[in-house]
């Protein structure tokens, strides 16, 4: 029997075991998180696997994933919301360490899908393990893009008090309109809300001694925030290594000076 | 064999105190989560509190009509959960379940205690 | 406070099978596990099905429990004349950060 003709994208197919990967990572999140005992994981997946299985793959909308979000709901203490721009890992890192402020990887629906890629096919119930579409050579609105637009936009959305974003110094563009960051979260930071937005600028060069926010686009981000009627403020983190040191030490006597 | 027995149920008057215990045997008290739950004459049951395990923050969480009058607490070193009740009224007037959790469900439950609030 | 909805009574002649449903929104049985207690009068409740369909060991295989978006069942098959008794839905209900429980329903065995 030949194989049913499959739609071929651009980008790279589903992760093996990815619905085993997404139940899975449920069951360990609300192992650890006691608010969250009561979930029941099977929903969980069932609602995920709605949003994109059987939909064509580059029409997928937030309005798929709402079944998702609505059981995904979980609350951020105000002043404890990380926001990050291309420097995941270090905002991990720290997170990991300041076990009081969460990042949306920290967070059930952003835990879950953290690393994944997944695509369904028009009017099958298969999951696409071959393929599934790029976000730039075939279209923006598929399963994974999607997802991170909504559930970011849901983040900031329920941000409160001061809130945090780690910027990449390092890049050409400190702050990048086009990035999640840029395109989703600034522009959905509630003013009734939100007293604050404070970024980290955090340098990639031991000897960087620069005042990173200065930079242009960082002027850029203040002026779109303050627009927003939201305060903003501006600190580098000229060596990220000390920084996290003393995040976890903080009574260490080097962590006293600048870092 | 996991056992739970309340006591400290009785007759008090409107706006009166009860302190309500459930002694727990036959499994780790420490790490199980502990609630207390209540059936009025007649009817169905009713959440009243419920308590986690210290070791997941030992917070207390308690139903909106018994907000502000009750306070669900426990001692470890004595593997007793309690009912601390004040301005009891009428409407309080149940048979009160203290029930242990298996992870995030409640698995066992004690016979019951009999609280009547009356002049 | 508000209950997860329940048909307040139920019957059926033995060796019937009967289907009591639970019915929640999404902060409850939608996002949460349900599970099911069955009460004889004047006796604690006892756990019959936890997590939408698992039996505790000593529990009959003629009951069974299923969930699907904010609504569960529980089904008992093969009805048998000691199957009388109240039967309680629950589910931790998010918004409240507290169980709810359903109105219970009394079983009949004809």
């Known amino acids: 029997v030949l194989p049913r003709w499959r739609q071929q994208w651009s980008g790279s197919g589903t992760t093996s075991r990815f619905p085993e990967t997404v139940l899975a990572r449920c069951v360990k999140y609300t192992e650890v998180h006691p608010e969250m005992r009561h979930v029941d994981c099977q929903s969980v997946w069932d609602a995920f696997k709605g949003a994109f299985i059987s939909k064509y793959p580059c029409n997928i909308t937030e309005e798929d994933y709402q079944p998702l979000v609505k059981l995904g709901t979980q609350t951020v203490p105000c002043n404890k919301t990380l926001l990050w721009s291309r420097i995941k890992d270090l905002a991990h890192q720290f997170t990991q360490v300041q076990r009081d402020m969460f990042t949306l990887e920290d967070m059930l629906l952003g835990y879950l899908a953290d690393d994944l890629t997944w695509c369904g096919e028009f009017n099958t119930f298969e999951i696409n393990y071959q393929s599934c579409p790029d976000w730039r050579k075939d279209c923006s609105n598929n399963p994974v893009s999607v997802f991170w637009k909504t559930v970011s936009r849901r983040f900031a959305e329920t941000a409160c008090g001061v809130v945090h974003v780690m910027l990449n110094g390092s890049r050409s563009k400190i702050f990048d309109k086009n990035s999640t960051f840029g395109s989703v979260e600034v522009h959905n930071l509630q003013p009734e809300k939100v007293q604050a937005l404070e970024a980290w600028v955090i340098h990639g060069g031991r000897e960087d001694s620069r005042d990173l926010c200065q930079d242009p686009t960082i002027k850029e981000l203040e002026s779109i925030i303050s627009k927003r009627n939201i305060r903003f403020f501006c600190k580098n983190i000229y060596r990220p290594d000390k920084f996290l040191q003393c995040v976890k030490n903080p009574e260490d006597s080097s962590c006293l000076s600048g870092i | 064999e996991v056992q739970l027995l309340e006591s400290g149920g009785g007759l008090v008057p409107p706006g009166g105190s009860l302190r309500l215990s459930c002694a727990a045997s036959?499994?780790?008290?420490?790490?199980?989560?502990m609630s207390w739950v209540r059936q009025a004459p007649g009817k169905g049951l009713e959440w009243v509190s419920t308590i986690r395990s210290k070791t997941d923050g030992g917070t207390p969480y308690s139903a909106d009509s018994v907000k502000g009058r009750f306070t669900i607490s426990r001692d470890d070193s004595k593997n007793t959960l309690y009912l601390q009740m004040n301005s009891l009224r009428a409407e309080d007037t149940a048979v009160y379940y203290c029930a242990k959790y298996d992870y995030n469900y409640m698995d066992v439950w004690g016979q019951g205690t009999t609280v009547t609030v009356s002049s | 406070q508000s209950v997860l909805t329940q048909p307040p009574s139920a019957s059926g002649t033995p060796g019937q099978r009967v289907t009591i449903s639970c019915s929640g929104t999404t902060s409850n049985i939608g996002r949460n596990y349900v599970h099911w207690y069955q009460q004889f009068p004047g006796t604690a409740p006892k756990l019959l099905i936890y997590r939408n369909s698992q039996r505790p060991s000593g529990v009959p295989d003629r009951f069974s429990g299923s969930k699907s978006g904010t609504s569960a069942s529980l089904a008992i098959s093969g009805l048998q004349s000691e199957d009388e008794a109240d039967y309680y839905c629950a589910a931790w209900d998010d918004s409240l950060n507290g169980w709810l429980f359903g109105g219970g329903t009394k079983l009949t065995v004809l």
């Open positions: 036959g499994f780790t008290f420490t790490n199980a989560w």
